[in-house]
Amino acid sequence: GWVWNQFFVPEEMNTTSHHIGQLRSDLDNGNNSFQYKLLGAGAGSTFIIDERTGDIYAIQKLDREERSLYILRAQVIDIATGRAVEPESEFVIKVSDINDNEPKFLDEPYEAIVPEMSPEGTLVIQVTASDADDPSSGNNARLLYSLLQGQPYFSVEPTTGVIRISSKMDRELQDEYWVIIQAKDMIGQPGALSGTTSVLIKLSDVNDNKPIFKESLYRLTVSESAPTGTSIGTIMAYDNDIGENAEMDYSIEEDDSQTFDIITNHETQEGIVILKKKVDFEHQNHYGIRAKVKNHHVPEQLMKYHTEASTTFIKIQVEDVDEP
């Protein structure tokens, strides 16, 4: 019968011929009366056999990631008779792995959006690297993830590639972050190969800023001939938030005379001071009103940022009109 051990050949061997093992018949007494032959894909070009001894050699550099095993057939013939000594047999040569591939992030570019002020531990995104080496061969494809850039705001779970928030961030200070993640094979041991990826993390806005008046004091004038409903001027607050989180409503906080009103222009986010009832220069020619501004939408959990509404004082001077 045939005698052989399992055949392994390391990939990427640079030698011109590399002895893999020996195929022999147990009838072979070593007197060179048998001839061994190799057949199948790779026979003669990748692998050769010593016809006399049955020793098998690899004569080409192999890449396991291209082909990890070869199925060949062996024959042994009695030279004197030309007859087969053993029935033709199929055998396998396995290409064994070396750590010749670095981890690669295949789904890049990565981009994630997370609300500003998210608590520590909030999941942002998971990045995954793949390694073409053999996962069953030692640690060649066992990866560890680490953060090269992004501290102290982000952390990455070493074995899963899950990126989490590690420190609260304020969109109004910085609205996006570039995080660089490294994946290292060999679980980080010597000889490890690595790959990196960049993750763009954008902060979405939450309503953590209240509107604040640009001026603590405004001065407006109104003619005593102005009819009710007249717009006598505008006031404006600013809000560091964006979108609907910056939408605001103006209102009168204090006007003993009940002469004025404020409406909000939702296009411009300005407050328009309106004459609610006619003024009479001879009766009163100086008014002072206090206006306040609040956000339109404030979720309950963000009310702590909106405790005291911003106010401004408006001095209104009535201009005299000569009466006939």
Epitope: E215, D256, S257, H286
Partner: antibody
Framework: QVQLQESGPGLVKPSETLSLTCTVS??????????WSWIRQPPGKGLEWIGY???????YYNPSLKSRVTISVDTSKNQFSLKLSSVTAADTAVYYC????????????WGQGTLVTVSS | EIVLTQSPGTLSLSPGERATLSCRAS???????LAWYQQKPGQAPRLLIY???SRATGIPDRFSGSGSGTDFTLTISRLEPEDFTVYYC????????FGPGTKVDIK
């Protein structure tokens, strides 16, 4: 802290024009929303408001003095001025410059006052 | 114009006593448009109260203001020696007018 300082002659002849200047320090006369006033106080008597000016040059005067008063402003010098024409002995007073408040038309900041005597 | 009348013209009290100064307007004014000042001899007036019950910066809490319509009051809860001087009310709704003053002197 806003400070105001009046300056000008202490003696003016009857029928002439009284001229005073108020220099503002510790703040800009162009600050939005503030009015700059002149107020006077005859010796031993009460206070009388003369008029005010806004940094844009818009002025408003006490109706009883309107025909004789001009208040002007020089934002480059951070000053505003009072001119009162055709003075008589009744115009003898301590003249104060003042700035109104951040929550109303009351007078929050005052100069220390300068006595102007009308006499020949 | 709105005429302000202050009473009494002179108020004679002892240190530690409560002083109540009155200011009456010739026509109704909004309470937001009245102020009180203190003036010591040779000095400019100093704002005490505006609106009519807000204390100006640095004014001790023994000073308080109240009132509405035509009647307004300045109260000094416990007179200190430095409080014996002249007090003026001022309205700033229809132009600007001052009352004639109330002198608080030591009895």
């Amino acid at each position: 802290q806003v400070q105001l300082q009046e300056s000008g002659p202490g003696l003016v002849k009857p029928s002439e024009t009284l001229s005073l200047t108020c220099t503002v320090s510790g703040g800009s006369i162009s600050s939005s929303g503030y009015y700059w006033s002149w107020i006077r106080q005859p010796p031993g008597k009460g206070l009388e408001w003369i008029g005010y000016i806004y940094y844009t040059g818009s002025a408003y005067y006490n109706p009883s003095l309107k025909s004789r008063v001009t208040i002007s402003v020089d934002t480059s010098k951070n000053q505003f001025s009072l001119k009162l024409s055709s003075v008589t002995a009744a115009d003898t007073a301590v003249y104060y410059c003042a700035r109104d408040g951040s929550s109303g038309w009351y007078f929050q900041y005052w100069g220390q006052g300068t006595l102007v005597t009308v006499s020949s | 114009e709105i005429v302000l009348t202050q009473s009494p013209g002179t108020l004679s009290l002892s240190p530690g006593e409560r002083a109540t100064l009155s200011c009456r307007a010739s026509q109704s004014i909004s309470s937001s448009y009245l102020a009180w000042y203190q003036q010591k001899p040779g000095q400019a007036p100093r704002l005490l109260i505006y609106g009519p019950s807000s204390r100006a910066t640095g004014i001790p809490d023994r000073f308080s203001g109240s009132g509405s319509g035509t009647d307004f009051t300045l109260t000094i809860s416990r007179l200190e020696p430095e409080d014996f001087t002249v007090y003026y009310c001022q309205q700033y709704g229809s132009s600007f007018t001052f009352g004639p003053g109330t002198k608080v002197d030591i009895k």
